[in-house]
């Protein structure tokens, strides 16, 4: 008789989750010499320990501390790129502009990117059937708490000019409920961060509006200013050209506004 198990509203743990994490860890530590000291088995043991045998709606940041400790990494604090609802372009950008880093360019972000995971209370099993949905089930689930924890630490580490890429195609260009709006904005350190520079990415080819005047951007400016951090904003009218010009800055067409 199969044992009754909690049915959550979200998708279950990503297939082959443990091996995926382990393989990503090995790949990352081999590509990044400064992380060669990391023992990937220990990283997996700590990752597993954060959620295995625990109720998947009762996960805390404390549960992830052993993993955070093992994944401690120094990135240039003035080369941080945050993003909201436009992950792919942000990642394409840092793949070209190799001296800038998104969270997913760090070990811990790289390990978990696009993965889902959860366990079950009082059993050592990984739940491959379903995991809690942030809205429908609970917010203190393993995935949400992980991203909240690493995002907070990433924002806290930032200094000087911090960049954020925002999706100009969305109704809320700045969304207070996004990870950027609810975690990262509030954990930038005013004593270290001088300016937050927003890059608003336009979707339509003929979209020539100044999206930096959008009410949600003004709301972001207000929040940032109240935290004694300067704010600036740029429209990226042509994201394809923007990337091309990052790759080839000498190109004659790159002197005009992107």
């Amino acid at each position: 008789v199969p044992r009754w198990r909690q049915q959550w509203s979200g998708p279950g743990t990503t297939k082959r989750f443990p091996e995926t994490v382990l393989a990503r860890c090995v790949k990352y530590t081999e590509i990044h010499p400064e992380m060669r000291h990391v023992d990937c088995q220990s990283v997996w043991d700590a990752f597993k320990g954060a959620f295995i045998s625990k109720h998947p709606c009762n996960i805390t940041e404390e549960d992830y501390q052993p993993l955070m400790k093992l994944g401690t990494q120094t990135v240039p604090c003035n080369k941080i790129l945050l993003w909201s609802r436009i992950k792919d372009l942000a990642h394409q950008f840092t793949q070209v502009q190799r001296d800038m880093f998104t969270l997913e360019d760090t070990l811990l972000g790289y390990l978990a990117d696009d993965l889902t995971w959860c366990g079950e209370f009082n059993t050592s099993k990984i739940n491959y059937q379903s995991c809690p949905d942030w809205r429908k089930d609970c917010s203190n689930n393993p995935v949400s708490v992980f991203w909240k924890t690493v995002s907070r630490r990433f924002a806290e580490a930032a200094c000087d000019v911090v960049h954020v890429m925002l999706n100009g195609s969305r109704s809320k260009i700045f969304d207070k409920n996004s990870t950027f709006g609810s975690v990262e904005v509030h954990n930038l350190q005013p004593e270290k961060v001088q300016t937050l520079e927003a890059w608003v990415i336009h979707g339509g080819r003929e979209d020539s509006r100044d999206l930096c005047q959008d009410p949600t951007i003004k709301e972001l400016e207000s929040i940032i200013s109240k935290r004694n951090i300067q704010f600036s904003c740029k429209n990226i009218y042509r994201p394809d050209k923007f990337l091309q010009c990052v790759k080839n800055p000498e190109d004659s067409s790159c002197t005009s506004e992107i």
Partner: antibody
Framework: EVQLLESGGGLVQPGGSLRLSCAAS????????MSWVRQAPGKGLEWVSV????????SNADSVKGRFTISRDNSKNTLYLQMNSLRAEDTAVYYC????????????????WGQGTTVTVSS | QSVLTQPPSASGTPGQRVTISCSGS????????VYWYQQLPGTAPRLLIY???QRPSGVPDRFSGSKSGTSASLAISGLQSEDEADYYC???????????FGGGTKLTVL
């Protein structure tokens, strides 16, 4: 050519200790997890212990927990198994084996095995 | 008593196809990979199949692995006299943090 050479086996009395060694060559030892697997006379394979490439993580079979300790010296390309409080049921050929993929041991097949060293626990 | 159950013996004539089964539970084989090892008489084990159905280089394609639910199988086609050996299935159990071996199957080529 990848080679693993076990040594340190022998006859020991119950309650005694023994330290097995496994000298590795032909590959970058510090990049791979390593295991000990044993085989009692006329019996099947029984996994004993495993250690990650950098030695930061180990795991042992319940039957040897608290008695056996796996360790490695990456500068000497050598794997060890310290066996204390030995029992008659520990009598076996002990094999050391290399992990197939780099660094970790979870889900990582043992792709190269040594020829084994014999441990006999008897009074 | 092994957690993975294999038949103690199997046999076949040269040229025949034989299969060896390995039965587990929904806490190991069902969710984890299966590995197969061959141990020729008086020698160390040799990796034959990894991650359910992958063959390491040097292993003839006569050997194949498959898995369905809580059972795995090793198939040997075109049986040869040198295939006479003990065959072990194994799986890594991440819950126990340990390798589990089947009891082994002695294959006799008649």
């Amino acid at each position: 050519e990848v080679q693993l050479l076990e040594s340190g086996g022998g006859l020991v009395q119950p309650g005694g200790s023994l330290r097995l060694s496994c000298a590795a060559s032909g590959f970058t030892f510090e990049d791979y997890a390593m295991s000990w697997v044993r085989q009692a006379p006329g019996k099947g394979l029984e996994w004993v212990s495993v250690i990650s490439s950098k030695g930061g993580s180990t795991s042992n079979a319940d039957s040897v927990k608290g008695r056996f300790t796996i360790s490695r010296d990456n500068s000497k390309n050598t794997l060890y198994l310290q066996m204390n409080s030995l029992r008659a049921e520990d009598t076996a050929v002990y094999y050391c084996a290399k992990g197939m993929e780099r660094q970790y041991y979870s889900y990582n097949a043992m792709d190269v095995w040594g020829q084994g060293t014999t441990v006999t626990v008897s009074s | 008593q092994s957690v993975l159950t294999q038949p103690p013996s199997a046999s076949g004539t040269p040229g025949q196809r034989v299969t060896i089964s390995c039965s587990g539970s929904n806490s190991n084989i069902d969710v984890d990979y299966v590995y197969w090892y061959q141990q020729l008489p008086g020698t160390a084990p040799r990796l034959l199949i990894y991650k359910d159905d992958q063959r390491p280089s040097g292993v003839p394609d006569r050997f194949s692995g498959s898995k369905s639910g809580t059972s795995a199988s090793l198939a040997i086609s075109g049986l040869q006299s040198e295939d006479e050996a003990d065959y072990y299935c194994a799986t890594w159990d991440d819950n126990l943090n340990s390798w589990l071996f089947g009891g082994g199957t002695k294959l006799t080529v008649l």
